[in-house]
Every structure is written in structure tokens, then in C-alpha cells.
């Protein structure tokens, strides 16, 4: 297993609709054809794999398990979007990238993106 650098933004604020997007960029030492990306959330005394996708370079990412994530890839960048977030989902979201094929296997883990989610205020009742 060889180490690889992964960069991601330090902080992202989710939209009022509970959608947060960020870029996960990895320094690929070679020409990987198969890449696995996993998003982990670290908060509340547990670490949770939020979503994961294995993709062939140039193809779109496919996520399993009714995923709340979507994503696209472009070169050594993965654009990730997490949907359906609520205030309780605020936490550190870590990007983990694995170069699966061809050998050698490379692993890179980012420092994490702190995603802040603010639940929208309910609209006040109106007579209009």
C-alpha cells in the first residue's frame, strides 16, 4: 500500500435545501483506470461511511445503497454532492481515495471538510 496526497476544502456550508458540494482532488502518481472514492463522516463519537463509489476513469460515479451522494469525475478531481442534510448532520466529512487498478495500490485520505448545515427557519404564517 502506497500513500497518496488528497486535498479537499476545509469548510463548506450546505445550502438551505440541505445540499453540500465539494471537490476531492488526489495526486495520482500514475495512470489509474479504476478508482474508489469513499466519504466518511466523523462526528458524535463514531465514524460512518457516508457513501462509496468505484468508477472507471472517464465514467460517472455510481453509488450504492440509496446513496445520498452524487458525483462526477474529471481527471484527478472528484466533484461530490451530498443531499438531504440536516443540522444534526453537521460534521467532518473525509474523502478517501483508493487507486485500485492497475497495481500498485495507492491510498489517500484527506484532512476532511467541515460541513455546516443550518436547518431553514419555517416560514411564518401569512394572511396574504
Amino acid at each position: 500500500c502506497k500513500a497518496m496526497h488528497v486535498a479537499q476544502p476545509a469548510v463548506v456550508l450546505a445550502s438551505s435545501r440541505g445540499i453540500a458540494s465539494f471537490v476531492c482532488e488526489y495526486a495520482s502518481p500514475g495512470k489509474a483506470t479504476e478508482v474508489r472514492v469513499t466519504v466518511l463522516r466523523q462526528a458524535d463519537s463514531q465514524v460512518t461511511e457516508v457513501c462509496a463509489a468505484t468508477y472507471m476513469m472517464g465514467n460517472e460515479l455510481t453509488f450504492l445503497d440509496d446513496s445520498i451522494c452524487t458525483g462526477t469525475s474529471s481527471g484527478n478531481q472528484v466533484n461530490l454532492t451530498i443531499q438531504g442534510l440536516r443540522a444534526m448532520d453537521t460534521g467532518l466529512y473525509i474523502c478517501k481515495v483508493e487507486l485500485m487498478y492497475p497495481p500498485p495500490y495507492y491510498l489517500g485520505i484527506g484532512n476532511g471538510t467541515q460541513i455546516y448545515v443550518i436547518d431553514p427557519e419555517p416560514c411564518p404564517d401569512s394572511d396574504f
Partner: nanobody, 126 residues
């Protein structure tokens, strides 16, 4: 409704290992995340680990991460919890539960789970 039956608990010395099993009957659980929780005497039920429907995603409590491993065999309708390097603080009644969804960010909360087993006792002596 799914019936869940846990087994594999027992008395073990600190540093030892146990493998818990949870068998499901009734409706298949292949489309649902599965979780393990535990409850020590006088304490609230707490999250231990969870595994997504496909088996590709996991969630672990910090206190067990690196020591416990959750896995599942959908063909056998069974979920497992491999517990290594056990500590006296791991002593509790361990429950298996079926999540109502394939996966979510709230898999560590009890309200996400519809069906529960009766539990299997794990005692770790020093």
C-alpha cells in the same frame, strides 16, 4: 415483521474474542441496513456498529472501531459482529436491529430501527 435472533454471546477473558450472529426470519432483510447496539446494566442502549444493505458501507462507534467488525451474509439472512481485543467495558447485552432504510447518516440512532432481537449477553472478565 422480521424476527431477529442473536447468538454467540458468553463469558470471555479480557483480550479474547467472540463472534455474534443475528439470524432473521420473516421478511428478507437484504434491502435494509443492519445494526448492533448494546446496553450495560443501568445505562442507556448505545450504538456499536451498522452495515448497509449491500454490505459496502459501515459505521462504528469510536469505542469499538478497529476492534469490532460487522459483516453480513444476505443469502443466509444473517449479520455478524466479530469482537476482538475485548475489554471489561464491553460487557453488555448486545442487540441486533433492522434499519428501515438501506443506509442513512442516522444509522447510529435507535429510532432508525424498526425490528429488534431479544439480545445476547456478553461478559468480559478481567
Amino acid at each position: 415483521k422480521v424476527q431477529l435472533v442473536e447468538s454467540g454471546g458468553g463469558l470471555v477473558q479480557a483480550g479474547g474474542s467472540l463472534r455474534l450472529s443475528c439470524s432473521a426470519s420473516g421478511r428478507t432483510f437484504a434491502n435494509n441496513a443492519m445494526g448492533w447496539f448494546r446496553q450495560a446494566p443501568g445505562k442507556e442502549r448505545e450504538f456499536v456498529a451498522s452495515l448497509s444493505a449491500s454490505g459496502s458501507l459501515t459505521s462504528y462507534a469510536d469505542s469499538v472501531n478497529g476492534r469490532f467488525t460487522i459483516s453480513r451474509d444476505n443469502a443466509k439472512n444473517t449479520v455478524y459482529l466479530q469482537m476482538n481485543s475485548l475489554k471489561p467495558v464491553d460487557t453488555a447485552l448486545y442487540y441486533c436491529a433492522r434499519n428501515r432504510r438501506a443506509w442513512s447518516l442516522s444509522v447510529h440512532t435507535t429510532r432508525e430501527y424498526d425490528d429488534w432481537g431479544q439480545g445476547t449477553q456478553v461478559t468480559v472478565s478481567s
